[in-house]
């Protein structure tokens, strides 16, 4: 449940940030989403959070970038490798992160519904069995 709330908050922050057109959005950052398919979510979140932390040194930090960093860090590994050579703009980075998060939210949302139905079925079945 908390995981889904955090993802929902991240998506909201990303929607706010990607709607902006200030000079910070043209900042060059590492493209951390070119990682191998078997890379864990926690590793990807850690890499994304590392990129956001580096933005602080460019003084492009704002409330929502801080919030994004805070929320990503809460779901991420503490350390991760950052050996990407490819680059992208901050705007593209945020857009790609948004797509990833929307997919995760959709998948987890469906899982939550499925789990709730399983619990409901189990409780109903259990109740019926005892009476």
């Amino acid at each position: 449940h908390n995981f889904n709330i955090t993802i929902k908050e991240i998506i909201k922050m990303l929607n706010i940030l990607t709607a902006r057109n200030d000079s910070c959005m043209e900042l060059t950052v590492k493209d951390v989403f070119t990682a191998p398919k078997n890379t864990s979510d926690k590793e990807i979140f850690c890499r994304a959070a590392t990129v956001l932390r580096q933005i602080y040194t460019h003084n492009c930090s704002n409330r929502y970038l801080r919030g994004l960093y805070r929320n990503l860090s809460s779901m991420a590994n503490k350390t991760c490798s950052m050996n990407e050579i490819k680059k992208s703009t901050l705007k593209d980075f945020l857009e790609r992160l948004k797509v990833i998060m929307q997919k995760k939210y959709y998948r987890h949302g469906l899982n939550d519904i499925f789990e709730a139905q399983k619990i409901e079925w189990h409780e109903h079945h259990h109740h019926h069995h005892h009476h």
Partner: antibody, heavy 119, light 107 residues
């Protein structure tokens, strides 16, 4: 305990200048963006300006752009507001505020310093 | 004219639910914070990021935000809740505050 203490408020004539100071304690000052917010007598709150952690980035409300300048000295845990070409409508209590990290909001406020612009 | 619009005043009997609104175009797509200010005092953060309570703020304070309206609710208003309440959000030009709502608690 987080504390923000403003000083420098005074009575000044229209067209005059004033520099407000805000000394911070109880937290790692250099890790936080800082802002100034004012409140005219009997009126609402008005955001004026923000400064980034190392002072490289500043941002101003249209009402004070070109007249006010925000700066900071991380070694002294102090943020400043230099106010030039003051007008009667600048009369207000000026608050120094911290832009939070845990809370994406102004999580701590000073008690304010009164600036009166009058001839 | 503020980008965030609040009603100037609200009167409640003690124990009733007080509902403050903050209206702005698509405000639900942004984060809204609420501050309480008592006479002669500095504002205090009361709700942050739409619906979260800072430590030390009583449970009777809650918030929500969707569409064009953000809401602050006090469930069971008390005499000490009499104050001005301001909503605030970040827009492209910077931070903006609503005009504030004064709550009177009758009792």
């Amino acid at each position: 305990e987080v504390q923000l203490v403003e000083s420098g408020g005074d009575l000044v004539k229209p067209g005059g200048s004033l520099r407000l100071s805000c000394v911070a304690s109880g937290f790692t000052f250099s890790s936080y963006d800082m802002d100034w917010v004012r409140q005219a007598p009997g009126k609402g709150l008005e955001w004026l300006s923000e400064i980034s952690t190392n002072g490289d980035r500043t941002h101003y409300a249209d009402a004070v752009k070109g007249r006010f300048a925000i700066s900071r000295d991380n070694a002294k845990n102090t943020v400043y507001l230099q106010m030039n070409s003051l007008r009667a409508e600048d009369t207000a209590i000026y608050y120094c505020v911290r832009d939070g990290y845990e809370y994406l909001a102004f999580d701590y406020w000073g008690q304010g310093t009164l600036v009166t612009v009058s001839s | 004219q503020s980008v965030l619009n609040q009603l100037p005043s609200l009167s409640m009997n003690m124990g009733e639910t007080a509902t403050f609104t903050c209206e702005g175009d698509n405000i639900g797509h942004k984060y809204v914070n609420w501050y309480q200010q008592k006479p002669g005092q500095a504002p205090v953060l009361t709700i942050y990021e739409d619906n979260k309570r800072p430590s030390g703020i009583p449970e009777r304070f809650s918030g929500s935000n969707s569409g064009n309206t953000a809401t602050l609710t006090i469930s069971g208003a008390r005499a000490e809740d009499e104050a001005d309440y301001y909503c605030e959000s970040e827009v492209s030009t910077g931070i903006v505050f609503g005009g504030g709502t004064h709550l009177t608690v009758l009792g």
